[in-house]
Interface confidence: low
């Protein structure tokens, strides 16, 4: 830690005297802060010397010396008083700026420590301090107003009693700024606007700030609009409101409107888009595919997005068939408004039954007319398999019918012994039917295919299984002929239900 000579901590001299302050450290040392021109500064090895041949009251202040190389960052200080009977105060700054609730140091330094007992703080021209002004005094630093308030932003003077008269310092202006937490708060109403050409419209841009020093403007595309500003103060905030009123809109009024407000902390901006249209419009769309496939027993939500101006005058969901004349229950239909001109309509179809496959239409109406959006709902089914023994053109044949959706694939398995299902170890042969015959393929219904296995391939006392599968699941049916071609209808005990 550096050492200052003389040792201090205070040194009192008279005006005109010579003053020498020497700072000595282990390494190089330096004096802190701005050194006034009245001082001569020179270095002498590990010491730094400040000297003046003609001390004045303006040299009154604390001089601090530091050793930059010191890892502990220590410093030494000495306070110099130049006691001038005519000048009891040395004011270091004529203006002090703080934020509310900070301590404000008014740097009027006493030039003579003896005068400390008779000091006081007053407002300009001797006016008393405002009530509740909490302050303290330090001869080294000046007066501190604690937790300064906005209203305490005034001109102050430091007063010292010299004999029987009070001697005032030059005035110090205290500016107390409100704490600005960020850019002004903004609202731009509405968030989006649509009007038909010739209609009236209004856009309101409002900003609020903790103090009055902020700017707000409304901009159309790249043009700042000249709009009268209405100012107000409520809820402890300053409000500025710009209202753009358009009696009859035209296409040139369309575009992007930005409400922009700025203060010392920065700027805040919010935008909205104004569309001007020739006539009423009504657009229906869906993010979903209009052709839907769902597994039977599962649920589905059908969603339609509506963009409309003016607003809807009516809407509903309708089941168009083909199976029953049921209509969707109103409780299963839900409407949500995303914003003024966009709505989402949802139809919930829980635990779908085969009779609920088909077409569902959403209809909406506004002054622009009617629009409809139709979904086609097909149910997916796992395959159902049946096998029969029949004679075709005099030959014994196994027929397998598989019904499901999507269309099932068919595979025949031959396995040893009698079983209701061929497992991997028992399989002797596998036949894949690449092109089963399509028996029926009606809209919104299962697809039924048929596969044939002829008698010459059949062997006595073996199990034949027809297996079908699709994306939903699989099904199978096993059959055991007693002797190839011996019977048209084998006994019931040889039919195995999967």
């Amino acid at each position: 830690i550096p050492v200052i000579e003389p040792s201090g901590p205070e040194l009192v001299v008279k005006p005109g005297e010579m003053v020498t302050l020497r700072c000595v450290g282990n390494g190089s040392v330096e004096w802190d802060g701005p050194i006034s021109p009245h001082w001569t500064l020179y270095s002498d090895g590990p010491s730094s010397v400040l000297t003046t041949t003609n001390a004045t009251f303006q040299n009154t202040r604390t001089y601090r010396c530091t050793e930059p190389g010191d890892p502990l960052g220590g410093s030494a200080a000495i306070h110099l008083y130049v006691k001038d009977p005519a000048r009891p105060w040395n004011v270091l700054a004529k203006e002090v700026v703080v934020f509310e609730d900070q301590d404000a140091l008014l740097p009027c330094l006493l030039t003579d420590p003896v005068l400390e007992a008779g000091v006081s703080l007053v407002r300009l021209r001797g006016r008393p301090l405002l009530r509740h002004t909490n302050y303290s005094f330090s001869p080294w630093h000046g007066f501190t107003i604690h937790r300064a308030k906005f209203i305490q932003g005034q001109d102050y003077q430091c007063s010292a009693l010299m004999g029987s008269r009070k001697v005032m310092s030059i005035s110090i202006r205290l500016k107390v700024q409100k704490v600005i937490p960020g850019p002004p708060a903004l609202t731009l109403v509405p968030e989006e606007l649509v009007r038909i050409r010739g209609e009236a419209a209004q856009i309101v841009c409002s900003a609020s700030n903790i103090d009055v020093d902020f700017d707000v403007f409304l901009q159309h595309n790249t043009t700042k609009l000249a709009i009268p500003q209405r100012s107000d103060f409520h809820d402890n905030r300053y409000q500025k409101v710009l209202t753009l009123s358009l009696g009859q809109v035209d296409f040139q009024h369309a575009g992007n409107y930005s409400c922009v407000a700025s203060n010392v902390q920065g700027k805040h901006s919010t935008s909205m888009f104004f569309r001007v249209v020739e006539s009423a419009y009504l657009d229906l769309s869906s993010e979903q595919n209009l052709i839907q496939e769902v597994t039977v027993g599962e649920g589905l939500n059908l969603k339609v997005m509506v963009e409309a101006y003016p607003g809807l005058q009516g809407f509903n969901w309708t089941y168009l068939g083909p199976f029953s004349d049921h209509q969707p229950e109103p409780k299963l239909a839900n409407a949500t408004t995303k914003d003024t001109y966009r709505h989402t309509f949802t139809l919930s179809l829980p635990r779908l039954k085969p009779s609920e496959a088909g077409c569902y239409s959403f209809l909406a109406r506004n002054p622009g007319g009617w629009r409809a959006l139709t979904f086609e709902l097909t149910l997916r089914y796992p395959p159902e398999v049946s096998v029969i023994w029949t004679s075709i053109n005099g030959s014994g044949t196994l027929l397998c019918a598989a019904s499901g959706y999507p269309q099932p694939n068919v595979t025949w398995l031959q396995c040893a012994g009698h079983t209701d299902r061929c497992d991997e170890a028992q399989v002797l042969q596998v036949w894949v039917d690449p092109h089963p015959e399509v028996l029926s393929q009606e809209p919104f219904q299962k697809v039924t295919v048929q596969s044939l296995l002829t008698a010459e391939t059949l062997e006595h006392n073996q199990t034949y299984e027809c297996r079908a599968h699709n994306s939903v699941g699989s099904g199978s049916w096993a059959f055991i002929p007693i002797s190839a071609g011996a019977r048209t209808h084998p006994p019931d005990e040889f039919l195995f239900t999967p």
Epitope: E95, V97, V98, F99, Q177, V179, I180, P181, G182, P183, D215, Q219, T222, S258, V260, S262, V264, Q265, G266, K267, S269, S271
Partner: antibody
């Protein structure tokens, strides 16, 4: 006239630390404007590094320096600081301190002359 | 982060020429854009703020325009002291970013 003078730059090894200072004269750093450090790698463009709000209560950092650099100020000395820790070769640049302009908010109307930081082993 | 792309990256012009530099933002930044001039070895100097407002003391031959994503700096009649590098900077939102710069050289 506002004057900003940076100091504290120099040669430092990777992983090392530096403290940059920016002494303001002709204007109090507590007077509401925000302050920032902006850097420029040799032969490259400008990169915003950090800002401190007018009240000193809010600080912002570029992702590239978050957790390594700290912006601060000493109102009594009217000085802005940038503490640089865990320095990397890519931190080599001239570091400018700048004052945020009032009307332009995030634009910078006064700049210092810059101080060069070289990170090299 | 918002990217600013300046074009061209460099240009050659003669004294008296009209020069236009563009700056495109990767997303809308309203009018929160500034333009700076920087000469070798010197700190940047603010020319335009809020996309089109001329900074005090800057010659009127400099002008800015644009909003949203596309901005332009125009020097109506290039002077010898205008040969420098020009940068755009956006300040809405954080983090603030600069364009890569446009160098204006003597033809």
């Amino acid at each position: 006239e506002v004057q900003l003078v940076e100091s504290g730059g120099g040669l430092v090894q990777p992983g090392g630390s530096l403290r940059l200072s920016c002494a303001a004269s002709g204007y109090s750093i507590t007077s509401g404007h925000h302050w920032a450090w902006i850097r420029q790698a040799p032969g490259k463009g400008l990169e915003w590094v950090s800002s401190i709000s007018g009240s000193g209560s809010t600080t912002y950092y570029a992702d590239s320096v978050k957790g390594r650099f700290t912006i601060s100020r000493d109102n009594s000395k009217n000085t802005l600081y940038l503490q640089l820790n865990s320095l990397r070769a890519e931190d080599t640049a001239v570091y400018y301190c700048a004052r945020g302009s009032y009307y332009g908010a995030g634009s910078f109307d006064y700049w210092g002359q810059g101080t060069l930081v070289t990170v090299s082993s | 982060d918002i990217q600013l792309t300046q074009s061209p990256s460099s240009l050659s012009a003669s004294v008296g020429d009209r020069v236009t530099i563009t700056c495109r933002a990767s997303q809308g930044i309203t009018s929160a854009l500034a333009w700076y001039q920087q000469k070798p070895g010197k700190a940047p100097k603010l020319l335009i703020y809020d996309a089109s407002s001329l900074e005090s003391g800057v010659p009127s031959r400099f002008s800015g325009s644009g909003s949203g994503t596309d901005f332009t700096l125009t020097i109506s009649s290039l002077q010898p002291e205008d040969f420098a590098t020009y940068y755009c900077q956006q300040y809405y939102p954080w983090p603030w970013t600069f364009g890569q710069g446009t160098k204006v050289e003597i033809k």
